[in-house]
């Protein structure tokens, strides 16, 4: 007895798709071995048509996948656009196609229900809208134009150009008759139901001489489209419900377990607290669709999820919706990042940002995400650069430690930075990815004077100390700009006594400009590092001035004046809309922070190297 | 909810064939699958077949115990699954539950149903 496992029996008509699932012990071996979908031959060979390998018979090109779910133990067999030589007997296994693990299983496509000579068929999903055309004769063009549902043996009148419509059509039918010439009247039925599956009968005229035309509408429950995402990726429903809709508030929602469906998210301002920081419903287009953006998948967001449009802002029969199911890979190719990090006032936090190894060449971007209304992310900064104005000096994006993995530091932390961001490329959208940085209690590790006055032509020196509990750490002073934080000389000048309760492993690291001038002017950032992680970090904005006392200035933390006030955001900066999360590039009008000049700061430190530590800063 | 009825259970003799029904009433629009189980007195509730479907598409899932000898169906428009069940033997005694699912992952597994029936006594005698 094999222990693959499927459906013994599929069964489907014409032109329609099947989802095959087959199931294995998700054993080691099992979970990486070939897996196939063949068809047995009268030689009682079976010919693979499918595999996990990528292979697909040219019987089957452009209408058929093999996807494996190994985490679950299964995989899916997808095919389109069935015909009737499609009948026949199949295995679904695993390794070799003569000795493998595998399943039988019959598939019957057949033609479809018997219908009336000259029957035209029409195939609409549930909520959308139909147009049955109804040919006729000159003769009968001055006669009464109607139309049937047929319902066993009887004809039930739906409508008819005397104004009658059947109350169960009400608000949602109208018959058209065109001008002189045209001989073919229209019936539109909008807002589909279930229940107006069936035959009708278009006619025009009475007596032996009246047209008829038989009309097939076949109501299908939209199916669902299956989506396979990794864990703590994205996935982006398009939902695109059609023109009629366009101006009626639209909605996602979840199907529960007592078969109603839960809103996730609609354009009311509605959203689902278990999505709070991760979710985006993008505006819509003129054609009226839309597309909702979840990142950081969890295993319990797998389910069926529908999207539609009514003015409720929730799931109504007899309105469109689309459907999907949503499966959740725990075999994830994104790795594990922290989703939640922690940061004191004052101090600093560095982010560990995933992205698709494959796309090291992609822009990287970093965005706020604000939930009012539909949710928006305006960036915050990017790789190439750019950076909201009122994070100068206080924001970086390296692209540190490379290989799937990029770094962000914010750093004056105040309780206003509490919240969800994202992180971003222009490439694989599935690897967008969400954090929340928390506002905790605390002191920052770090001590820098808050800001300093330079003077020309004259020697700073900027202490920053370190806790003993950073003494393997690579210590780090670095000039900020908008692309980047240029590493600069520091010297390490022995023990801190900013540090009680502490051992020799505090340490007093400082940087020196000397002489000062006017380049120097801007950000500076002490941190610490272990290769190519960077820990926490301190700012300090040096202001440089005309030359009044000579001498050489010692800033120490008891001198040190308070923070400049942060600079607010110029009211001419374009709101970003969250359509730009689609294509990031749409960011570029955004206001660009001017560059401080010369990146290494007209930094001149006269250090020997063994005091020296040299750092890597960003690798831009 | 979804509410699921059996009927067409009885005491029959080994190598007879019975027909059981399970008609669902309620809120049946998203129901995705149905399926039977059964249950013999001291032993575990067990798979025996579930039939699942997407538009005009049907799957039939059966048990290696009943395969060739029973066969599900279902009537879309009575929103009613079958159980054909010929050359009963007397292993297949037990109490006969109908199932249905909103979304299955494995139709094998007894947690991944919704919705249950109270059951109907199968009783086939040597």
């Known amino acids: 007895k094999s222990p693959v496992f499927g459906p013994q029996e599929v069964s489907s008509v014409e032109g329609n798709s099947v989802s095959i699932k087959c199931y294995y012990p998700p054993t080691s071996v099992n979970r990486h071995t070939r897996k196939y979908w063949c068809r047995k031959g009268a030689s009682g060979r079976c010919i693979t048509l499918v595999s996990s390998e990528g292979y697909v018979s040219s019987n089957y090109a452009g209408r058929a996948n093999l996807t494996n779910f190994p985490e679950n133990g299964t995989f899916v067999v997808n095919i389109a656009q069935l015909s009737r030589d499609d009948s026949g007997h199949y295995k679904c296994g695993l390794g070799i196609n003569s000795r493998g693990l595998s399943f039988d299983v019959s598939l019957e496509v057949s033609q479809g229900p018997e219908l009336p000579n000259g029957t035209e068929v029409y195939t609409v999903d549930v909520g959308r809208t139909v147009t049955i055309k109804c040919p006729f004769k000159t003769e009968n063009a001055p006669k009464t134009k109607a139309l049937y549902k047929k319902i066993g043996q009887t004809s039930v009148l739906v409508i008819d150009s005397r104004n009658y419509v059947n109350p169960n059509y009400k608000d949602r039918i109208r018959l058209r008759i065109p001008g002189t010439g045209q001989l073919i009247f229209t019936v539109v039925i909008d807002r589909l139901r279930l229940s107006d599956h069936g035959l009708y009968l278009c006619q025009a005229g009475d007596g032996s001489n009246r047209d008829e035309k038989n009309a097939d509408l076949q109501v299908l429950e939209p199916e669902p489209e299956l989506v396979y995402e990794d864990l703590r990726g994205s996935v982006t429903f398009h939902c695109a419900l059609g023109l009629e809709v366009a101006n009626v508030a639209k909605f996602l929602c979840r199907v529960n377990s007592r078969e109603t469906c839960d809103v996730v998210i609609n354009t009311l301002g509605k959203r689902d607290s278990a999505f709070e920081g991760r979710i985006l419903l993008n505006p819509q287009d003129k054609d009226g669709s839309f597309s909702v953006v979840i990142t950081g998948l969890r295993k319990e967001d797998e389910g069926r999820y529908l999207c539609g449009a009514h003015s409720d802002g929730q799931l109504q029969e007899g309105w469109p919706i689309q459907a999907w199911q949503l499966f959740v890979n725990e075999e994830s190719t994104i790795p594990r990042s922290p989703t939640v990090v922690k940061g004191v006032a004052g101090g600093s936090v560095a982010v560990l940002c995933p992205y698709n190894p494959k796309e090291s060449q992609s822009l990287k971007y970093w965005c706020l995400w604000e939930g009012a209304q539909n949710g928006r992310c305006p960036l915050l900064v990017e790789s190439q650069g750019l950076v909201q104005e009122q994070y100068e000096g206080r924001l970086s994006l390296l692209q540190e430690p490379g290989n799937g993995t990029f770094t962000v530091i914010l750093n004056q932390l105040t309780t206003q930075d509490a919240g969800f961001y994202w992180c971003l490329t222009n490439g694989d959208t599935r690897w967008r990815t969400t954090v929340e940085i928390k506002i905790i209690e605390g002191e920052p590790n770090l001590k820098v004077p808050g800001n300093v006055t330079a003077v020309l032509g004259e020697t700073l020196n900027i202490p920053c100390h370190f806790p003993c509990k950073f003494s393997s750490y690579e210590k780090y002073w670095c000039k900020w700009s908008n692309t980047g934080c240029q590493t600069l000389p520091s010297q390490d000048e022995g023990p801190s006594e900013a540090f009680v309760n502490c051992d020799e492993n505090s340490r007093l690291v400082s940087l020196t400009l000397n002489p000062v001038t006017r380049a120097d002017e801007g950000w500076y950032w002490c941190g610490v590092k272990q290769g190519h992680f960077y820990g926490e970090t301190a700012a300090v904005y040096v202001a440089v001035e005309e030359k009044k006392v000579a001498g050489s200035r010692y800033v120490s933390p008891a001198k040190a004046d308070a923070a400049p006030d942060e600079k607010v955001l110029d009211s001419g900066v374009r709101e970003i809309e969250n359509k730009a999360i689609q294509d990031p590039r749409l960011f570029a009008e955004e206001k660009v922070v001017a560059d401080t000049g010369d990146q290494a700061g007209g930094s001149r430190a006269s250090v020997d190297s063994s005091s020296s530590e040299e750092q890597g800063g960003s690798s831009k | 909810e979804v509410q699921l009825v059996e009927s067409g259970g009885g005491l029959v003799q080994a190598g007879d064939s019975l027909r059981l029904s399970c008609a669902a009433s309620?809120?049946?629009?998203?129901?995705?699958?149905m399926g039977w189980f059964r249950q013999a007195p001291g032993k575990e509730r067990e798979f025996v077949t579930t039939i699942t479907w997407s538009g005009p598409t049907n799957y039939k899932y059966y048990a290696d115990s009943v395969k060739g000898r029973f066969t599900i169906s279902r009537d879309n428009a009575k929103n009613t699954a079958y159980l054909q069940m010929n050359s009963l033997k007397p292993d297949d005694t037990a109490v006969y539950y109908c199932?249905?699912?909103?979304?299955?992952?494995?139709?094998?597994?007894?947690?991944?149903?919704?919705?249950w029936g109270q059951g109907t006594q199968v009783t086939v005698s040597s």
């Open positions: 199932a249905a699912s909103t979304v299955l992952t494995d139709p094998r597994v007894p947690t991944e149903y919704d919705y």
């Open positions: 309620g809120r049946t629009r998203t129901t995705y699958g």
